[in-house]
């Protein structure tokens, strides 16, 4: 009786169970009554990452420098190439097909998390007692100057965009 289902790492074809090709190899010919499945290794620029019956290997991803991409990890016959972005850029999507410049945090916001090749800058509003007066992809919110430690007094209150202005204490009493 011909099988209706096959074991793991096998597939059903012409009423018989044939072995799948291992990762890194493509299917050339199904098994026959005389021989096992014929598989061949993927070529230099190709890969297959699972046990498969694919008759063509997949091309490795191309990290296009014109799109700001560079190779993070070279592909093998069993893995795809992993691209990442050049310095100052990050991936536009999870598949990282192109890159965009890191965003800067505007005045009043500081960098909570510096961007990487795969993630954008994360900004946060400067809380009370902190400020940022620049547009930057690196600078965190900075604390207001402590006038007291300098034996000075606050002449102008700070905001999320400006530091306090300290001045000498009024000695006229």
């Amino acid at each position: 009786e011909p099988p209706t289902a096959c074991r793991e790492k096998q597939y059903l074809i012409n009423s018989q169970c044939c072995s799948l090709c291992q990762p890194g190899q493509k299917l050339v010919s199904d098994c026959t009554e005389f021989t096992e499945t014929e598989c061949l290794p993927c070529s230099e620029s190709e890969f297959l990452d699972t046990w498969n019956r694919e008759t063509r290997c997949h091309q490795h991803k191309y990290c296009d420098p014109n799109l700001g991409l560079r190779v993070q990890q070279k592909g093998t016959s069993e893995t795809d190439t992993i691209c990442t972005c050049e310095e100052g850029l990050h991936c536009m999507s999870e598949s990282c097909e192109s890159c965009v410049p890191h965003r800067s945090c505007l005045p009043g916001f500081g960098v909570k998390q510096i961007a990487t090749g795969v993630s954008d800058t994360i900004c946060e509003p400067c809380p009370v007692g902190f400020f940022s007066n620049v547009s930057s992809a690196f600078e965190k919110c900075r604390p207001w100057t402590s006038c007291e430690t300098k034996d000075l007094v606050v002449q102008q209150a700070g905001t999320n965009k400006t530091d306090v202005v300290c001045g000498p204490q009024d000695r006229q009493r």
């Epitope: 010919s29 021989t35 014929e38 061949l40 008759t55 063509r56």
Partner: antibody
Framework: QLQLQESGPGLVKPSEILSLTCTVS??????????WGWIRQPPGKGLEWIGN???????YYSPSLKSRVTISVDTSKNQFSLKLNSVTAADTAVYYC????????WGQGTLVTVSS | QSALTQPPSASGSPGQSVTISCTGT?????????VSWYQQHPGKAPKLMIY???KRPSGVPDRFSGSKSGNTASLTVSGLQAEDEADYYC??????????FGGGTKLTVLG
């Protein structure tokens, strides 16, 4: 049972094009095997791989013959073909077609003589 | 790529064992477990006897066996019989969907 049969002229003039066809019967050219090959054997000499074709048309050629050889496929006729340009007497051989890269099925071969 | 190197001839008496070698490089025989052996009788098409170094198609007698060490593959025919007299060719995958054959070995069964 899978069978392969080569056909084409047995005599070709020097500098002309050698053309052969392999007809597959007992199975489809686009299922069970997905790659098909050509091999030749000059009289009294050894086997030489010419090239292979994927049923969707991708081709793989021997580096030594690459500049002169073209392999094509016609799935509707269950055939694949060989063309060899600018032939010389050195191309006189028995030409075989075969299945896959393992070559577990062969045609019976056809002798092609290059002579004027 | 160059043809794989086989001895031009080998011989043995009926019942004996004979081994035919097939030497390539690390880019073909040594680099892949894709060595095949073919038997060819005069005027006939070659017949696959061994594939993937040591696997035998069903129907091929178990007197035929294959092995590989480094860049050299071997075909051993044990219990030699008169019908084993033929030419034997090895082939190997050579990367990038390329194949290469050996030059062939004429096996003679003595007596």
């Amino acid at each position: 049972q899978l069978q392969l049969q080569e056909s084409g002229p047995g005599l070709v003039k020097p500098s002309e094009i050698l053309s052969l066809t392999c007809t597959v019967s007992g199975g489809s050219i686009s299922s069970s095997s997905y790659y098909w090959g050509w091999i030749r054997q000059p009289p009294g000499k050894g086997l030489e791989w010419i090239g292979n074709i994927y049923y969707r048309g991708d081709t793989y050629y021997s580096p030594s013959l690459k500049s002169r050889v073209t392999i094509s496929v016609d799935t509707s006729k269950n055939q694949f073909s060989l063309k060899l340009n600018s032939v010389t007497a050195a191309d006189t051989a028995v030409y075989y077609c075969a299945k896959g890269f393992r070559f577990d099925y062969w045609g019976q071969g056809t002798l092609v003589t290059v002579s004027s | 790529q160059s043809a794989l190197t086989q001895p031009p001839s080998a011989s043995g008496s009926p019942g004996q064992s004979v081994t035919i070698s097939c030497t390539g490089t690390s880019s073909d025989v040594g680099g892949y477990n894709y060595v095949s052996w073919y038997q060819q009788h005069p005027g006939k098409a070659p017949k696959l006897m061994i594939y993937e170094v040591s696997k035998r198609p069903s129907g091929v007698p178990d007197r035929f066996s294959g092995s590989k060490s480094g860049n050299t593959a071997s075909l051993t025919v044990s219990g030699l019989q008169a019908e084993d007299e033929a030419d034997y060719y090895c082939s190997s995958y050579a990367g990038s969907n390329n194949l290469v054959f050996g030059g062939g070995t004429k096996l003679t069964v003595l007596g």
